[in-house]
């Protein structure tokens, strides 16, 4: 009886269970009553990443420098090229097809997580006791200066954008 289902890494064609081509190879000819499946390695700059019966390999992704992209991991016959963004830029999507400049955190906000090639800067508001007076993609919120440890007193309160201003303590008059 001809099979109606085949084992793993096989496919059914013309009532025959044929072996799939291994990753990195494409199908040249289906198996027959007389022959095994014929497969050929993918060419330079091509890949197939699964057991397959594809007659054409896929082209490796091109990391276009005009879009701010560079190669993070070179493709093989079994894997696609992985692109990432140039320094100071990050991918606009998971597929990393183009890049945008990292966002800076405005005064009053600090960097919670520095941007990577695939994720943007994450900013957070500076909580009480902390400030940021610059627009930066790297600077965290800084703690207000502790006047007490310098034997000084707060002359001007800090905000989320400014540090406290310390001054000398008033001398007690007799």
């Amino acid at each position: 009886e001809p099979p109606t289902a085949c084992r793993e890494k096989q496919y059914l064609i013309n009532s025959q269970c044929c072996s799939l081509c291994q990753p990195g190879q494409k199908l040249v000819s289906d198996c027959t009553e007389f022959t095994e499946t014929e497969c050929l390695p993918c060419g330079e700059s091509e890949f197939l990443d699964t057991w397959n019966r594809e007659t054409h390999c896929h082209q490796h992704k091109y990391c276009d420098p005009n879009l701010g992209l560079r190669v993070q991991q070179k493709g093989t016959s079994e894997t696609d090229t992985i692109c990432t963004c140039e320094e100071g830029w990050h991918c606009t999507s998971e597929a990393c097809e183009s890049c945008v400049l990292h966002r800076s955190c405005s005064p009053g906000f600090g960097v919670k997580q520095i941007a990577t090639g695939v994720s943007d800067t994450i900013c957070e508001p500076c909580p009480v006791g902390f400030f940021s007076n610059v627009s930066s993609a790297f600077e965290k919120c800084h703690p207000w200066t502790s006047c007490e440890t310098k034997d000084l007193v707060v002359q001007q309160a800090g905000t989320n954008k400014t540090d406290v201003v310390c001054g000398p303590q008033d001398r007690l008059r007799a």
């Epitope: 040249v28 000819s29 289906d30 027959t32 009553e33 007389f34 095994e36 014929e38 007659t55």
Partner: antibody
Framework: QVQLQQPGAELVKPGASVKLSCKAS????????IYWVKQRPGQGLEWIGG????????NFNEKFKSKATLTVDKSSSTAYMQLSSLTSEDSAVYYC????????WGQGTTLTVSS | DVVMTQTPLSLPVSLGDQASISCRSS???????????LHWYLQKPGQSPNHLIY???NRFSGVPDRFSGSGSGTDFTLKISRVEAEDLGVYFC?????????FGGGTKLEIK
């Protein structure tokens, strides 16, 4: 239905070349190899080789590598085998055949090499 | 090359008899994929070969069940359980496990 059509006979002089044809119909030509087999009168069969019409890739019996050239014309769904430097040893019936979802043979071309 | 040896060369039978043809190969025909590419076919006078059995024991569509194939490795047999007049001709075995593909010399099935 699947058919492989071959001319009935060819008469050629020693030293010359001949191009035998095999016209396929009734199926997608590029999906299956075409193979060629030689049968001399009253003798057994010899496998010459095959060609993949999809990409022109061939596999050969080493014995026939310098004797036979296999080609295809996809536009007319025809396979060809050219035999060169013919001698009386090349006089035989030449069959084209295809397998996959059944086996199909042409009727054979009788090649006579004679002066 | 793999040498295929068929016996007997000639097999005289009476109609209705059982016939048995042997085919031996000079090396194992078991392919690395687990299949054994040993095949049988019949050639009648003035005709193209007609395939009967593929991969040792699988009958092609339309082949009567009186034809059966068996064997493994290097030793194979074709049996015809009750010979009919239309079965007469030359039987060949062939192997397609190893390149070049090779054929047996043939066994002529004829009336006693």
């Amino acid at each position: 239905q699947v058919q492989l059509q071959q001319p009935g006979a060819e008469l050629v002089k020693p030293g010359a070349s001949v191009k035998l044809s095999c016209k396929a119909s009734g199926y997608t030509f590029i999906s299956y190899y075409i193979y060629w087999v030689k049968q001399r009168p009253g003798q057994g069969l010899e496998w010459i080789g095959g060609i993949n019409p999809r990409n022109g890739g061939t596999n050969f019996n080493e014995k026939f590598k310098s004797k036979a050239t296999l080609t295809v014309d996809k536009s007319s769904s025809t396979a060809y085998m050219q035999l060169s430097s013919l001698t009386s040893e090349d006089s035989a019936v030449y069959y084209c055949t295809r397998h996959g979802n059944g086996v199909y043979w042409g009727q054979g071309t009788t090649l006579t090499v004679s002066s | 090359d793999v040498v295929m040896t068929q016996t007997p060369l000639s097999l005289p039978v009476s109609l209705g008899d059982q016939a048995s043809i042997s085919c031996r190969s000079s090396q194992s025909l078991l392919h690395s994929n687990g299949n054994t590419y040993l095949h049988w076919y019949l050639q009648k006078p003035g005709q193209s070969p007609n395939h009967l059995i593929y991969q040792v024991s699988n009958r092609f569509s339309g082949v009567p069940d009186r034809f059966s194939g068996s064997g493994s490795g290097t030793d194979f047999t074709l049996k015809i359980s009750r010979v009919e007049a239309e079965d007469l001709g030359v039987y060949f075995c062939s192997q397609t496990t190893h390149v070049p593909w090779t054929f047996g010399g043939g066994t002529k099935l004829e009336i006693k």
